[in-house]
């Protein structure tokens, strides 16, 4: 009679993570008598997956009833497959022996490949805010996918970015892989409403990429522009001076009025108006009693925005002239105003 052969008809089996893998194995003869065992890998370090004779293998079920006398089908099913199950599986026939069974013949092996989808990409931006014209870095990470081949793209408001570097780890063979990418983005004043998107495409996703997003509102700081103007006279001895704080983001802003270098009033921006681009405008006014001053008054609007060094704009109020005349001469008085940093 022809010697028993162990046949594993499938050279390779591809299974999605979470699914059940069927590993097929048949013997060509009932002789010699003895059990079948399944191993992952070959050689002394091989891992026992299933033993027909003894042991507890909760994830493994047999396709046919191995207790039947004439059974020659030793196929198994492994449930809830994970990338860690990838490898080559061998169906091995043992001959009954004493005290131990002896390995008789092995199948050619079936390579189990596991497809696992990438995790949702996580995008993170810089720790500190940056101002327009500066370049900031965003990172994108996704893990746990297999096979290794993957596509990663970056977008800003739907437009593809080209300045990025991507690594897939590990470089060699592994049960699953991770991707890490860093993109450089140049900020503009209009970026408060902008979004950066990292998109990951993988064979398991079947054309529908996963996306991770970051809002540039978390990253950008748009410093305000200041304008100090003198309004027409409110009363005989009073002048109304306004400080227009324009196009700033985020909202956190504190304004201080100084009269000849002395603090007159400090307030925090509350009732701001929002511009279309997401930046804010705010206006503060100061009522100056001209009769209380003998000399010219230097009024300074000092703004501290989002914890940054203060910026200021000054306006010279001439007391010598009649108040009513001053109100009609706003433009001329503003020529001497200057912007400077106060540290």
């Amino acid at each position: 009679e022809e010697e028993l052969q162990v046949i594993q008809p499938d050279k390779s089996v591809l299974v999605a993570a979470g699914e059940t893998a069927t590993l097929r194995c048949t013997a060509t003869s009932l002789i010699p008598v003895g059990p079948i065992q399944w191993f992952r890998g070959a050689g002394p370090g091989r891992e026992l997956i299933y033993n027909q004779k003894e042991g507890h293998f909760p994830r493994v079920t047999t396709v046919s009833d191995l207790t039947k006398r004439n059974n020659m089908d030793f196929s198994i099913r492994i449930g809830n497959i994970t990338p860690a199950d990838a490898g080559t599986y061998y169906c091995v026939k043992f001959r009954k022996g004493s005290p131990d069974d002896v390995e008789f013949k092995s199948g050619a092996g079936t390579e189990l490949s596991v497809r696992a989808k990438p995790s949702a990409p996580v995008v993170s931006g810089p720790a500190a805010r940056a101002t327009p014209q500066h370049t900031v870095s965003f990172t994108c990470e996704s893990h746990g996918f297999s096979p290794r081949d993957i596509t990663l793209k970056w977008f800003k408001n739907g437009n593809e970015l080209s300045d990025f570097q991507t690594n897939v780890d590990p470089v060699g063979e592994s049960v699953s892989y991770s991707i890490h990418s860093t993109a450089k983005v140049v900020l503009t004043r209009e970026d408060v409403h902008s979004q950066v998107i990292c998109e990951v495409a993988h064979v398991t996703l079947q054309g529908d990429p996963l996306r991770g997003t970051a809002n540039l509102s978390e990253t950008i700081r748009v410093p305000p522009t200041l304008e100090v103007t003198q309004q027409p006279v409110r009363a005989e001895n009073q002048v109304n001076v306004t400080c227009q704080v324009r196009k700033f983001y985020p909202q956190r802003l504190q304004l201080t009025w100084l009269e000849n270098g002395n603090v007159s009033r400090t307030e925090t921006a509350s009732t701001v108006t929002e511009n279309k681009d997401g930046t804010y405008n705010w206006m503060s006014w100061l009522l100056v009693n001209v009769s209380a001053h003998r000399d010219d008054v230097k009024l300074t609007c000092q703004v501290e925005h989002d914890g940054q060094p203060a910026v200021s704009k000054s306006h010279d109020l001439k007391v010598s002239a009649h108040p009513k005349e001053q109100g009609s001469n706003t433009a001329a008085e503003n020529t001497g105003s200057n912007e400077r940093n106060i540290y």
């Epitope: 591809l14 999605a16 979470g18 497809r115 989808k117 993957i150 596509t151 739907g158 495409a201 993988h202 064979v203 398991t204 996703l205 079947q206 054309g207 529908d208 990429p209």
Partner: antibody, heavy 123, light 107 residues
Framework: QIQLVQSGPELKKPGETVKISCKAS????????VNWVKQGPGKDLQWMGW????????TYVEDFKGRFAFSLETSASTAYLQINNLKNEDSSTYFC????????????????WGQGTSVTVSS | DIQMTQSPASLSASVGETVTITCRAS??????LTWYKQKQGKSPQLLVY???TLAEGVPSRFSGSGSGTQFSLKINSLQPEDFGSYYC?????????FGGGTKLEIK
């Protein structure tokens, strides 16, 4: 060659359930998604959603959430569309179609279609 | 949801003529647009993808163009087999909505 073969026409009463099959051949079934498209008597096409044959996750368009269910029998390379509690407005032809993607794994369209299954709902 | 508007709804032309069908998206869909052709009583067939790439086996008399919100499908030198309905569909996110279709008839 690649083929998607759908089950035959169905005549049902309102309130009943119908299950349409779509058997794929000529390619590895679990490599490509299966889309479902409805074509009403007015002849307009409506994308109902799709099922990822690898992860088994389904995406449904808002209009098709609830009574509609996509399912798979991967060992038989078959996708199913089940419609519960049938209504008169479900009378249409239903197509299954394979979702194609490029070398970078980006979807670009439906490259192979089933022949369509006509469902008539009438009391 | 993104709306796709096709025009004209119907069109009569003669064999040998050149026709253009347009498709407008309610918002920017970049080049994520596909064109399908459907003959009476048959399944739709993929014609053009990514706005301008011809699908395998599609004759060169067909051409797609456009990006953003405006797209068109041009058929040069119409052949008898070109008559039928044409649909555009976007795939910029979900749901992947179709246009209302354009019925191309023989004059």
């Amino acid at each position: 060659q690649i083929q998607l073969v759908q089950s035959g026409p169905e005549l049902k009463k309102p309130g009943e359930t119908v299950k349409i099959s779509c058997k794929a051949s000529g390619y590895t079934f679990t490599d490509y998604g299966v889309n479902w498209v409805k074509q009403g008597p007015g002849k307009d096409l409506q994308w109902m959603g799709w099922v990822n044959t690898n992860t088994r996750e389904s995406t449904y368009v808002e209009d098709f959430k609830g009574r509609f269910a996509f399912s798979l029998e991967t060992s038989a390379s078959t996708a199913y569309l089940q419609i519960n509690n049938l209504k008169n407005e479900d009378s249409s032809t239903y197509f299954c179609a394979r979702g194609a993607y490029d070398a970078y794994y980006y979807y670009y369209g439906m490259d192979y279609w089933g022949q369509g299954t006509s469902v008539t709902v009438s009391s | 949801d993104i709306q796709m508007t096709q025009s004209p709804a119907s069109l009569s032309a003669s064999v040998g003529e050149t026709v253009t069908i347009t498709c407008r998206a309610s918002e920017n869909i970049y080049s994520y647009l596909t064109w399908y052709k459907q003959k009476q009583g048959k399944s739709p067939q993929l014609l053009v993808y990514n706005a301008k790439t011809l699908a395998e086996g599609v004759p060169s008399r067909f051409s797609g163009s456009g990006s953003g919100t405006q797209f068109s499908l041009k058929i040069n030198s119409l052949q008898p087999e070109d008559f039928g309905s044409y649909y555009c569909q976007h795939h910029y996110g979900s749901p992947r909505t179709f246009g209302g279709g354009t019925k191309l008839e023989i004059k």
